[in-house]
């Protein structure tokens, strides 16, 4: 760092809002593809390269010339198994946060053309290219339709497909957003013998509506309408299919065989939550109730004598919760062992830790194969060897993020094999594997600057750096940035951590005005070793406040006991952690107690708002963005895993006592900015316009801004300058900054 | 490796029923359709009808009154089987897998001769 | 039920030099159309499918175009393997439909 530890003699520049605005300093990726155990695809100047991992040369794989002629912006592209085609992707259209409708072409990588015959249509929602060869699976008009090579004609699998009525092969809103995080609800077996696919129907599901203004020049603005099921209304219901693709004949009917949900889950309302193929013949399906503290885990097997798949009752595996719900979002996937008779998961163990546990398909009960309180985040990789696990049990920091191999043959010889390469600039590490997992490439971002390296699993020795972002840090070496705090503060004798991101030159004598970044919702973190430029990055850097979050009752990875904490109970524990997290911070001495704010989006401007509705005397100000203001507003799926249902006999009362509008008095001791993009299919504009409309009611003055057309992410660029901006002013006002 | 191996042809007698066997190996005949088509002495190709993966069955409209297509998977066999036989069904049958729109494998073909 | 008329009923063709067979369908098949060779005393194999697609280990010599009502086998240069009859069939409607054959000679 050039700079003296004296502020005033510190002659560089700061990093300004215009700075996060324009996005001047930019961190660079090294986005990879593995298209084999030992080649990955990188694209670089518009050319796309293949890179040997072992020796790391490269040669052109696709010149950017070749698609000069070709007439439409490709927005992406996606390269057959076999390497034989490559699909690309233009006329983009958003959806929602996964979903969007696109054009396809193929080009034939072996012949240099386009094929022009057979052409996938426009408007198509979903493609997915078999995991070998070149066959193709798409959706269009909510049907399912099968190329067995790209120059043929489809094979149309399904027939009862109709706009937002039945899905076939994609999710519905709710499936989507909260289930799959994916559009597509499709899973090819691992050869492409079969297609397995889930239908979603919303015949029943009641409507969301919302104005679009669009242009100027629409005299009447158009009406949005999305099956949307809030919390206790109903839900969409679904059936599972598998077609074997080897049997498709355009003169005849495709036949999908259903596999039924076992009967646990048929006595009600369930969801079908995770897809995954063991083998060829060999598929897992998880189940959860609409209660979602009982999930079940089918295994069925393919009979070629009949062409029906099976279920044995002996090989569900049961996975419930007593003290919340099952899995941090949804109930974890399988990783299946190569003959498909046994697997592992993450599982929550008696401590309550998330740990991996081994199964075999045929006993009920499981061995965990790690151990701590710690907890493992994600499985990586399974070979016949070795399983690769990220997990934060390094230096018993949860905000950390670490490699680890396990021997499977003896599981008490584990190895972290990110822990000690970097360890002052890398404490947060994610992986992406070769194709069997024998090259990897290590992402670091943070605490330093993002370091992207590969590594040979033969020795996990280091191959070479990738990316090591050393022409931004030498541009933000005239920067003067801020620092962040990684730290935790003892509550009930029980560790809560936060982070500050400090201004420069923070010297602890003097006060500074604190911005607490709160979002706080179930299974969150925010408190982590990731190195971020953000608007907290300006605040710190140019406006010399200190920018803190704190994950308190509620957040994620450390274990249920934290975690279930709010089960039931949202607006309670996670909320007033906030208020006592603020009060620690102001007697650390350095935070001016008078100039304290609390910012917060979706679910932290739920936070945000119960907080500065509580009547607290610490908060002075806060701005809530797209924010949750009643449960009953929200999707049945996300707030009833943690509210249950909105019923007398459940949790009615707590539904109507944890109400933003029910603290509209309190709202006259501070000043308040409310936000909300007009529309926002995920927190829908009603929730905001009932928070106005109970301020206007008992009188508060307070300050508020809509977003025409925006939705959950106020991310047009014209609009994601003028919140930042605008809120930029906010919190100057508030906290008398010039 | 896949096959079809054909028998049960021969000589018939007007008015008699015909069952023919296709028997596959190297592939489920649960997965794949089976077709039959005919062919005369010195003639073309022509079609009679098909069971499909699921069991389903679609004919020709000249064959339908008096053919059955059947199968047994647990055999991988499948069956022709036509009744009320007059000389000009005197043809080689063949068996053929069908390959979504086209037959990638043919059974050897079998004769079968309908005369008095 | 859809037609299909083959031309020439027979050709021949001297070794080497380029055989052509046209295939026309009553009404439009798009592109649903198949070719099999049929040698002596043997069951027919397939050689190209969906009008222009190669089967496995058929030599590039053949070769198929066509769409709509259209189709024409070529075999760019004949060889004495090559004697047979060539049927086209069309996959496009049940009942499922062949060409009455062309019978490929040596000259």
């Known amino acids: 760092n050039k700079g003296t530890d004296d502020a005033t003699a510190d002659s560089r520049k700061t990093y300004t809002l215009t700075d996060y605005l324009k996005n001047t300093y930019r961190l660079k990726l090294y986005s990879l593809r593995w298209i084999s155990d030992h080649e990955y695809l990188y694209k670089q100047e518009n050319n796309i390269l293949v890179f040997n991992a072992e020796y790391g040369n490269s040669s052109v794989f696709l010149e950017n010339s070749t698609f000069d002629e070709f007439g439409h912006s490709i927005n992406d592209y996606s390269i057959s198994p076999d390497g034989q085609f490559i699909l690309l992707e233009y006329n983009y259209v958003k959806q929602w946060r996964h979903s969007y409708t696109a054009s396809y072409d193929i080009y034939d990588l072996n012949k240099r053309q386009l094929i022009t015959e057979e052409r996938i249509p426009n408007n198509t929602q979903w493609v997915t290219w078999s995991p070998v060869g070149h066959k193709l699976a798409y959706v269009w008009n909510n049907d399912i339709y099968v190329k067995i090579e790209p120059n043929l004609p489809s094979y149309r699998i399904t027939w009862t497909g109709k706009e937002d009525i039945i899905y076939n092969g994609i999710t519905d809103w709710v499936y989507e957003e909260e289930v799959f995080s994916a559009y597509s609800a499709l899973w090819w077996s691992p050869n492409g013998t079969f297609l397995a696919y889930a239908q979603f129907n919303d015949t029943e599901v009641p409507l969301i509506e919302y104005s679009f203004y669009s242009d100027e020049s629409l005299q009447y603005p158009k009406t949005v309408r999305v099956p949307y099921p809030k919390a206790g209304a109903v839900n969409p219901t679904v059936k599972f299919f598998v077609v074997n693709t080897d049997s498709l004949s355009s003169v005849t009917n495709a036949t999908s065989i259903q596999i039924t949900a076992p009967a646990s889950m048929l006595i009600g309302d369930h969801y079908l939550c995770d897809v995954t193929w063991a083998t060829q013949e060999r598929i897992s399906l998880q189940w959860l109730r609409r209660i979602q503290n009982y999930s079940v885990m089918d295994i069925c097997d393919y009979d070629e004598s009949s062409g029906r798949w099976n279920c044995l009752v002996a090989r569900q595996h049961i996975e419930m919760s007593t003290t919340g719900w099952v899995g941090r979002f949804r109930p974890s996937e399988p990783h299946f062992t190569l003959d498909g008779n046994s697997f592992y998961k993450i599982i929550s163990n008696e401590e309550g830790y998330r740990h991996i546990c081994y199964f075999q398909i045929d006993k009920k009960d499981c061995t965990f194969i790690t151990k701590g309180t710690w907890e493992v985040i994600g499985i990586e990789a399974l070979t016949s060897d070795y399983l690769y696990y990220i997990s934060n049990e390094y230096k018993g920091m949860p905000g950390g993020r670490n490699l680890y191999k396990i021997q499977l043959s003896d599981y008490t010889k584990v190895t972290c094999l990110s822990c000690e390469l970097n360890p002052e600039r890398c404490q947060y590490y994610s992986v992406s594997f070769s194709k069997e997992a024998k090259y990897y490439q290590l992402r670091c971002s943070g605490p330093g600057l993002p370091l992207y390296t590969l590594h040979s699993s033969v020795n996990d020795k280091g191959l070479r750096v990738l990316e090591d972002n050393s022409a931004l840090d030498k541009m933000l070496q005239n920067v003067q940035m801020p620092s962040k705090k990684l730290d935790f503060i003892i509550l009930n004798e029980t560790k809560f951590w936060y982070q500050m991101i400090l201004p420069p030159h923070f010297d602890k004598s003097k006060k500074y005005p604190l911005l607490l970044d709160v979002y706080a919702g179930p299974c969150s973190q925010k408190a982590d070793t990731v190195f971020r430029l953000n608007w907290a990055t300006y605040l710190a850097s140019t406006e010399n406040i200190i920018v803190a979050s704190f994950d308190g009752r509620g957040s994620g990875y450390q274990g249920d006991k934290i975690m279930h904490a709010i089960n039931r109970r949202l607006g309670t524990f996670e909320v007033e952690d906030q208020i006592e997290a603020a009060r620690q911070f102001s007697k650390m001495g350095f935070v001016d107690n008078k100039r304290i704010a609390i910012w917060g989006w979706s679910y932290g401007g739920y936070v945000t708002s119960m907080v500065l509705g509580s009547g607290s005397g610490v908060f002075k100000c806060g701005i809530a963005v797209a924010p949750v203001s009643r449960w009953e507003y929200y999707d049945s799926v996300y707030t009833e895993r943690y509210m249950g249902l909105p019923t007398p006999e459940d949790n009615l009362d707590h539904y109507r006592n944890s109400t933003v509008m029910s603290r509209a008095e309190n709202f006259k001791q501070v000043e308040y900015l409310l936000i909300h993009g007009t529309a926002d299919d995920n927190v829908h504009f009603q929730q905001s316009a009932q928070i106005s409309k109970a301020l206007v009611d008992v009188g508060v003055d307070f300050q508020a801004m809509w977003y025409t057309d925006e939705d959950h992410g106020i991310a047009s660029s014209t609009a994601h300058q003028h919140i930042y901006t605008h809120m930029s002013h906010f919190i100057k006002q508030c906290f008398s900054l010039p | 490796e896949v096959q079809l191996v054909q028998s049960g042809g021969g000589v018939k007698q007007p008015g008699e029923t015909l069952r023919l066997t296709c028997t596959a190996s190297?592939?489920?005949?649960?997965?794949?359709?089976v077709h039959w088509v005919r062919q005369a002495p010195g003639k073309g190709l022509e079609w009679v009808g098909v069971?499909?993966?699921?069991?389903?069955?679609d004919y020709d409209a000249a064959f339908m009154s008096r053919v059955t297509i059947s199968k047994d998977t647990s055999k991988s066999t499948a069956y022709l089987q036509m009744n009320s036989l007059r000389a000009e069904d005197t043809a080689v049958y063949y068996c053929?897998?069908?390959?979504?729109?086209?037959?990638?494998?043919w059974g050897q073909g079998t004769t079968v001769t309908v005369s008095s | 039920e859809i037609e299909m008329t083959q031309s020439p009923s027979s050709l021949s063709v001297s070794a080497g030099e380029r055989a052509t067979i046209s295939c026309s369908a009553s009404?439009?098949?798009?592109?649903?159309l198949n070719w099999y060779q049929q040698k002596p005393g043997q069951a027919p194999r397939l050689l190209i499918y969906?009008?222009?697609n190669l089967h496995t280990g058929v030599p590039a010599r053949f070769s198929g175009s066509g769409s709509g009502t259209d189709f024409t086998l070529t075999i760019s240069r004949l060889e004495p393997e090559d004697v047979a009859i060539y049927y086209c069939?069309?996959?496009?409607?049940?009942?499922?439909?062949f060409g009455s054959g062309t019978k490929v000679e040596i000259k």
């Open positions: 069939q069309q996959s496009n409607k049940l009942p499922l439909t």
């Open positions: 009404q439009d098949i798009r592109n649903s």
């Open positions: 053929m897998r069908n390959r979504h729109d086209w037959f990638d494998y």
């Open positions: 069971i499909w993966g699921d069991g389903r069955t």
């Open positions: 969906y009008s222009s």
């Open positions: 190297g592939f489920s005949l649960t997965t794949y359709g």
